[in-house]
């Protein structure tokens, strides 16, 4: 039975041009984390796998930097990049846990984040 | 004693291909990842590859992309690494290593004594 | 790709001298940062892991500090065993890349 929760930075917004910090937590389980992918719609934008460490796509690697923990920063921000990000993490026994965040990104310095969410 | 063995090296020509072995014992093999790194003749190290505990992970340097292959046989408790379209900028001594491991920031903690590769007409 | 730079790329030392080498990496790796000490046709050998943990059996001279994107490997008095090539090595993402090594040799 699955009893983990991903927590996740929810929907947040953030300037074009600068950065932003996707992250997730998985919480409530004992299962082990053995690789975490982290995807933009259905592209694979990095991996941080248990024995291997990061790995990161090569169409994203000037733009995308691995951390801090599990997190991913996202660099040089631009329009393109609002959309879905998911955070997958593969664990043993459990299986697979997701975990959502909602990223815009906005001409003008209104950025804020959005609240926190639990994702079960 | 932990230990691992390489094993394959030698001379070959240029576009050829080459199998190398490492043989390890003295650990549980298949719950470690595993490296292969490579050094020119008076250069430094080279990391070439990467696999896995398991085997269902591997990663590449860009130079050796789509050329060579790494891969494990656990119950065996050996690593390989096919090489296939050699190049003269391959020559190197080939080492098999422990490791890393990043749950545990280790690096790699167990070397070969390393095989030489020449590449040559 | 994570780019580690090191220095010097080599010196000259006496016994019984403190030596340091650093190492910068291109970006944070936290304290993904291991060193290694490699001799002439030998295999390279873990002297530091995790930035300052020493690894097990080397001597107690050697240490290591740093985090983030810049590192030093210390020996504390140097001795004749000692002279070789040093390299350090980021563990965080592949590629995992070394430092162009530092030759410690005898004054």
């Known amino acids: 039975m699955m009893t983990g929760t991903i927590e996740t930075t929810g929907n947040i917004s953030a300037e074009k041009g600068g950065s932003i910090i996707l992250q997730c937590h998985l919480s409530s389980t004992t299962a082990q984390v053995t690789q975490v992918n982290w995807e933009q719609q259905d592209q694979l934008l990095a991996i941080c796998n248990a024995d291997l460490g990061w790995h990161i796509s090569p169409s994203f690697k000037d733009r995308v930097a691995p951390g801090p923990g599990l997190g991913l920063t996202l660099q040089s921000l631009t329009v393109n990049d609002t959309g879905e990000y998911f955070c997958i993490y593969h664990t043993y026994p459990d299986g697979t846990y997701t975990g959502r965040i909602f990223l815009e990104v906005l001409e003008s310095s209104v950025a804020e984040h959005g609240a926190r969410f639990q994702i079960p | 004693e932990v230990q691992l063995l390489e094993s394959g090296g030698g001379l070959v020509q240029p576009g050829g291909s080459l199998r190398l072995s490492c043989a390890a014992s003295g650990f549980t093999f298949s719950t470690y990842a595993m490296s292969w790194v490579r050094q020119a003749p008076g250069k430094g190290l080279e990391w070439v590859s990467a696999i896995s505990g398991s085997g269902g992970s591997t990663y590449y340097a860009d130079s050796v992309k789509g050329r060579f292959t790494i891969s494990r046989d656990n119950s065996k408790n050996t690593l390989y690494l096919q090489m296939n379209s050699l190049r003269a900028e391959d020559t190197a001594v080939y080492y098999c290593a422990k490791g890393p491991r990043y749950q545990d920031r280790a690096g790699m903690d167990v070397w070969g004594q390393g095989t030489t590769v020449t590449v040559s007409s | 790709d994570i780019q580690m730079t090191q220095s010097p790329s080599s010196l000259s030392a006496s016994v019984g001298d403190r030596v340091t080498i650093t190492c910068r990496a291109s970006q944070s790796i936290s304290s993904y940062l291991n060193w290694y000490q490699q001799k002439p046709g030998k295999a390279p050998k873990l002297l530091i892991y995790?930035?300052?943990s020493l690894q097990s059996g080397v001597p107690s001279r050697f240490s290591g500090s740093g985090s983030g994107t810049d590192f030093t490997l210390t020996i504390s008095s140097l001795q004749p065993e000692d002279f070789a090539t040093y390299y350090c090595?980021?563990?965080?993402?592949?590629?995992?890349?070394f430092g162009g090594g530092t030759k410690v040799e005898i004054k």
């Open positions: 995790a930035a300052s």
């Open positions: 090595q980021q563990s965080l993402a592949t590629p995992y890349t």
